[in-house]
């Protein structure tokens, strides 16, 4: 337990005085926080948080879902924690099945254990399929299993968390990994026509096609040397995974001579930007 010099605020003291505690399902959890400036206990697991203003946290009949981190905080904002595992042979994993990974980043499969004393806490492919050869993971019984450096090829990968028990694999509920692609190139932009010659009063309509790996690509029509917001309409499609197309159509229903000029379709993503232009020349009716 923490100890500091007198006069200096110190963190609360927790009994039992250990960082981890393992209890059996149905047993009592009894945690005592000793501090003259006690404020609260906080319990955290996955996305769940509970608070308790009593300095003794008592759970009479522990369940697997009482597994988690119990933190005592004092009036100085100092805290101390104990992690409690509630061993339940019928519920080895707590799960949050949402699983999104950004390409090239690590992502956490949230399947913390209710009992850390297990063998081969791992990821397994669904229906006995092997995991991708290059997939690497880091297990943490209190948090789950971290997939290292998510690849685009892992999109829609079906996974289970797994442990070995008496020679057999025990699997968690299944997870489906959804990969958000990283931008590794600028958007591809093209325009329906490079130049237009119209008579005054005719309709001007031009379409810019923007292609990228995801819909979070930004695009806009701009008139060169002008801040005026142009009216544009969008259509978009996902042609399978990581193949997004947007069509941005700029329309001037009745073109005037002073509408003549260069119009730019501009698109950007986190990698960079691209643009393409079209020229409009409007002549009077004469």
């Amino acid at each position: 337990q923490p100890s500091v010099s007198p006069g200096e605020p110190s963190p609360p003291s927790i009994h039992p005085g250990k960082s981890d505690l393992i209890v059996r399902v149905g047993d009592e959890i009894r945690l005592l926080c000793t501090d003259p400036g006690f404020v609260k206990w906080t319990f955290e697991i996955l996305d769940e948080t509970n608070e308790n203003k009593q300095n003794e946290w008592i759970t009479e009949k522990a369940e697997a879902t009482n597994t988690g981190k119990y933190t005592c905080t004092n009036k100085h904002g100092l805290s101390n924690s104990i992690y409690v595992f509630v061993r339940d042979p019928a519920k080895l994993f707590l799960v949050d099945r949402s699983l999104y990974g950004k390409e090239d980043n690590d992502t956490l499969v949230r399947c913390p254990l209710t009992d850390p004393e297990v063998t081969n806490y791992s990821l397994k492919g669904c229906q006995g399929k092997p995991l991708p050869k290059d997939l690497r993971f880091i297990p943490d019984p209190k948090a789950g299993i971290m997939i290292k450096s998510v690849k685009r090829a892992y999109h829609r990968l079906c996974l289970h968390c797994s442990v070995d028990q008496e020679g057999k694999s025990v699997l968690s509920e299944k997870f489906i990994l959804k990969v958000r692609p990283a931008f590794k190139a600028v958007p591809v932009v093209s325009v329906s026509k490079a130049s237009y010659l119209l008579r005054e009063g005719e309709e001007f309509t031009v379409t810019c096609t923007i292609k990228d790996v995801s819909s979070s690509v930004y695009s806009t029509w701009k008139r060169e040397n002008s801040q005026t917001k142009l009216q544009e309409k969008y259509n978009s499609w996902h042609h399978g995974d990581f193949n997004y197309e947007r069509q941005a159509t700029l329309t001037i229903s009745s073109a005037r001579v002073n509408d003549s000029g260069v119009f730019m379709c501009y698109a950007n993503n986190t990698f960079g930007s691209a643009n393409v232009t079209t020229t409009l020349e409007v002549v009077d009716k004469g």
Epitope: Y121, G125, I138, P139
Partner: nanobody, 128 residues
Framework: QVQLVESGGGLVQAGGSLRLSCVAS????????MGWFRQGPGKEREFAAA????????YYADSVKGRFTISRDNAKDTVYLQMNSLKPEDTANYYC?????????????????????WGQGTQVTVSS
């Protein structure tokens, strides 16, 4: 820097037992996952067993499951590999390994690319 020194290897008859030890010196032993790899004659180095820093969560290769047991004593900065029902195919140099962030691959196999520190190895020979 972490130094790993293995001991306990030797010659044993098939069906016999050996207990390997690996003592770590240097940084905080309790923060590291520890494990054992082995390299048989003319073979590539392969994973045998591992134990996470919590001292409770363990990993075994299929070839040693049910026969080998890994354990650690953080007070003694030591990791052990108890090897029972030894077979001639267990003959190998056994290397102790430490990693702050161990990475595993399919089948719960510790990827040796994520090992931070290696021991020099201890020879185990199982005669038939």
């Amino acid at each position: 820097q972490v130094q790993l020194v293995e001991s306990g290897g030797g010659l044993v008859q098939a069906g016999g037992s050996l207990r390997l030890s690996c003592v770590a010196s240097g940084r905080t032993f309790s923060s590291y996952a520890m494990g054992w790899f082995r390299q048989g004659p003319g073979k590539e180095r392969e994973f045998a067993a591992a134990i996470l820093s919590n001292g409770l969560t363990t990993y075994y290769a299929d070839s040693v499951k049910g026969r080998f047991t890994i354990s650690r004593d953080n007070a003694k900065d030591t990791v052990y590999l108890q090897m029972n029902s030894l077979k001639p195919e267990d003959t190998a140099n056994y290397y102790c390994a430490a990693a702050f962030t161990p990475e595993f691959r399919d089948g719960g196999i510790w990827d040796d690319a994520s090992v931070d520190y290696w021991g020099q190895g201890t020879q185990v020979t199982v005669s038939s």
